[in-house]
């Protein structure tokens, strides 16, 4: 029998800057029941506080509700593991809520094949921001990324949509069934999970020649152009 091993706080995430949750990995248990407690203080303060909510985030977690979440303040936190033989301490983690935002996936993903008589056919993709995020306050800028692939293909094609909530794509394989997903990230923070996949059947007569692959803003009514490989590479590695 041994004291517990050193725990490790490995992740903190906020869905919207209003609340956040941190998770830890327990250390080795030493063969005895082990009790974990998370304590924290805000930078510039000396008063230590215990985790306000060990339940909401699931096992080995601490959830900070609205009344415990402050913007522009760094939280310094540590997990203590104790059993009958002694105690162990995690390294301290410094957390600024601004930089740990991971939004929920975008909502209401809709995909349509548009085949106007006088213009080239295209795939039109539209979505809504996640509900927990209030974009009106100006606290948030959400960036979006779309991925799509034929149902049986292994590789995804990825497009960066910037701040738009709709996007048009021309270069598709006729007759194929495509999966389409979208995700979002704040200007500082983490990509959301991908939204549930939406399926779309591309008609067999969805054709285009090479000259049509570059689409002008005018053709799209002021919408996003297909981005270059360079742009795609730059934006994809956030």
């Amino acid at each position: 029998q041994l004291p517990p091993g050193k725990p490790e706080i490995f992740k903190c995430r906020s869905p919207n800057k209003e609340t956040f949750t941190c998770w830890w990995r327990p250390g080795t248990d030493g063969g005895l029941p082990t009790n974990y407690s998370l304590t924290y203080h805000r930078e510039g303060e000396t008063l230590m506080h215990e985790c306000p909510d060990y339940i909401t985030g699931g096992p080995n977690s601490c959830h900070f509700g609205k009344q415990y979440t402050s913007m522009w303040r760094t939280y310094i936190m540590m997990v203590n593991a104790t059993n009958q033989m002694g105690s162990s301490f995690s390294d301290e983690l410094y957390v600024d809520v601004t930089y740990i935002v991971q939004p929920d996936p975008p909502l209401e993903l809709a995909v349509e094949v548009k085949q106007p008589e006088d213009r080239k056919p295209y795939l039109w993709i539209k979505w809504s921001p996640p509900t927990l995020i209030d974009l009106k306050t100006g606290w948030f800028t959400l960036l979006y990324e779309i991925r799509l692939k034929p149902e049986k293909a292994a590789e995804w094609e990825i497009h960066f949509a910037g701040q738009q909530t709709e996007f048009k794509i021309l270069s598709l394989h006729p007759g194929q069934k495509y999966l389409v997903q979208v995700r979002c990230k704040p200007d500082h923070g983490y990509w959301s999970a991908w939204s549930p996949a939406t399926f779309i059947q591309i008609p067999s007569d969805f054709t285009m020649n090479d000259e049509q692959k570059l689409i002008s803003e005018e053709d799209l009514g002021g919408e996003q152009k297909l981005i270059s490989e360079e742009d795609l590479h730059h934006h994809h590695h956030h």
Epitope: L2, P3, P4, G5, K6, E8, G27, T28, G30, M78, G86, S87, S88, F89, S90, D91, E92
Partner: antibody, heavy 120, light 107 residues
């Protein structure tokens, strides 16, 4: 520049007491846990005792439990080791070492040591 | 307490050699392991922490690997300045323990 300077070592008879001090400079002392590590002549390193930043947790090696007491004075930027009931096997070079964090991590800075000799 | 066992106790090598020192823990310690270098008459100096992270200012010829109970320190190309004694130390529990040391000497 981080500096740790040990003092208080010397020749002492078995059963007697000695108090070691470690004066810290070049860093915010109360942001770090501190430790005593010893090395008997020609031997390896042995962790003696440690204390977290606010003295809220203290630990001792099995060989010194009940005889040695670690303490710190953050205002004076000092670490202490009160050694009672000294034995011949406590003869060693005693190092003061800084933990790399406030609680439990590796030792990133060491003093040059103070020699304690227990002999009649 | 957790026992740390280093091997070999002594290692004879030449400048330019690749040198590997092993450290075994008696219980799982995750990656909470540090390696120190000590030269005669000097205090130890940390080389590696968290099993494989190189301490700032330490030459890149030093590297660490392992997790759980088996760990290694590797010096990719031994330099004259590297002849010293090396210690592993676990900090998985508050009571720290060191290996008995490995002396790297000139062949």
């Amino acid at each position: 520049e981080v500096q740790l300077v040990e003092s208080g070592g010397g020749l002492v008879q078995p059963g007697r007491s000695l108090r070691l001090s470690c004066a810290a400079s070049g860093f915010t002392f109360d942001d770090y846990a501190m430790h005593w590590v010893r090395q008997a002549p020609g031997k390896g390193l042995e962790w003696v005792s440690g204390i977290i930043w606010n003295s809220g947790h203290i630990g001792y090696g099995d060989s010194v439990k009940g005889r040695f007491t670690i303490s710190r004075d953050n205002a004076k930027k000092s670490l202490y080791l009160q050694m009672n009931s000294l034995r011949a096997e406590d003869t060693a070079l005693y190092y003061c070492a800084r933990d790399s964090g406030r609680y439990q991590s590796y030792f990133d800075y060491w003093g040059q040591g103070t020699l304690v000799t227990v002999s009649s | 307490d957790i026992q740390m066992t280093q091997s070999p106790s002594t290692l004879s090598a030449s400048v330019g050699d690749r040198v590997t020192i092993t450290c075994r823990a008696s219980h799982i310690i995750s990656s909470w392991l540090a390696w120190y270098q000590q030269k005669p008459g000097k205090a130890p100096k940390v080389l590696i922490f968290k099993a494989s992270s190189l301490e700032s200012g330490v030459p890149s010829r030093f590297s660490g690997s392992g997790s759980g109970t088996e760990f290694t320190l590797t010096i990719s190309s031994l330099q004259p300045d590297d002849f010293a004694t090396y210690y592993c130390q676990q900090y998985n529990t508050y009571s720290r323990t060191f290996g008995q040391g490995t002396k790297v000497e000139i062949k």
